[in-house]
């Protein structure tokens, strides 16, 4: 039976450019976490596996950074970022848990400040 | 440049253990995991299991996991992959593979050992 | 485990031909699928991979996509030296696996 939770940051927001923390916590469960997979939508991020170490995706290669721990670091963000991940924690002897984050994007404070105050 | 350098075809009998080496050279070595692959003649390809070269920890295809053991060498950059109470069905080409960088796939192979359970 | 089910498993074309072999996982394997060729008495060499990137020095005839469970790898102009077999293979969860292979011969 399956007696563990997901606890995620839920719902977040993060400025253009800036960097993000995708942190999952798996508790209430004594099973083994052998591997954790990182995913958007219909693509995957990252995984990390227990024993063999990270998989980084090659479209996130250059602005996804291990960790910390089985969590993710998504860095230089757009807009286009903004949506559903997916961390789904792969456990012996349970199965199965998935977590969701939904990520926000915003254009900078110092944009949207820019676009309204505009000088003459 | 990456090269992977097996050792040479091994004769066992039933029951028997053998002991497989993969040489690496032209990266460095604990920074990337090796993996081994068999291949039965005729058939497909079926994953054995990889090797962490920085810790030692290990990943197996339960299939194998009570009888293969997958160890290195840091110090002459070498993998080594033993399958023991060896089968007639256990007769395969045996590779060793290294992934991408952080990545899993299959980017280097070594030409590959071809081991013959034989009584 | 998951099951990499392989179509078809061997295939006749024509040089020139566009040729087309799918792949389905038996459950959700996201983008973590790679293709690999290989030619007889040869080790496996990788193509294509998450799934649709081409690996360093791979001819811009071999593309691939999906996601989820099903996937295509496709060969735009058949040449001679594509005469092989090609194998598809997940590493979204251990065990890794491979499909059964599509032996591609010239009519």
């Known amino acids: 039976m399956m007696t563990g939770t997901i606890e995620t940051t839920g719902n977040i927001s993060a400025e253009k450019g800036g960097s993000i923390i995708l942190q999952c916590h798996l508790s209430s469960t004594t099973a083994q976490v052998t591997q954790v997979n990182w995913e958007q939508q219909d693509q995957l991020l990252a995984i990390c596996n227990a024993d063999l170490g990270w998989h980084i995706s090659p479209s996130f290669k250059d602005r996804v950074a291990p960790g910390p721990g089985l969590g993710l670091t998504l860095q230089s963000l757009t807009v286009n970022d903004t949506g559903e991940y997916f961390c789904i924690y792969h456990t012996y002897p349970d199965g199965t848990y998935t977590g969701r984050i939904f990520l926000e994007v915003l254009e900078s404070s110092v944009a949207e400040h820019g676009a309204r105050f505009q000088i003459p | 440049q990456v090269q992977l350098v097996q050792s040479g075809a091994e004769v066992k009998k039933p029951g028997a253990s053998v002991k497989l080496s993969c040489k690496a050279s032209?990266?460095?070595?604990?920074?990337?995991?090796i993996y081994w692959v068999r291949q039965a003649p005729g058939q497909g390809l079926e994953w054995i299991g990889g090797v962490n070269p920085s810790n030692g920890n290990t990943n197996f295809n339960e299939n194998f996991k009570s009888r293969a053991t997958l160890t290195v060498d840091k110090s002459s950059s070498t993998a080594y992959m033993e399958l023991s109470r060896l089968r007639s069905d256990d007769t395969a080409v045996y590779f060793c593979t290294r992934g991408n960088y952080y990545g899993y796939e299959f980017a280097y192979w070594g030409q590959g050992t071809t081991v013959t359970v034989s009584s | 485990d998951i099951q990499m089910t392989q179509s078809p498993s061997s295939l006749s074309a024509s040089v020139g031909d566009r040729v087309t072999i799918t792949c389905k996982a038996s459950q959700h394997v996201s983008t973590a699928v790679a293709w690999y060729q290989q030619k007889p008495g040869k080790a496996p060499k990788l193509l294509i991979y998450?799934?649709?990137y081409r690996y360093t020095g791979v001819p811009s005839r071999f593309s691939g996509s999906g996601s989820g469970t099903d996937f295509t790898f496709t060969i735009s102009s058949l040449q001679p030296e594509d005469i092989a077999t090609y194998y598809c293979q997940q590493h979204y969860s251990t065990p890794w696996t491979f499909g059964g292979g599509t032996k591609l011969e010239i009519k």
């Open positions: 998450s799934p649709s």
């Open positions: 032209g990266y460095t070595f604990i920074s990337y995991n």
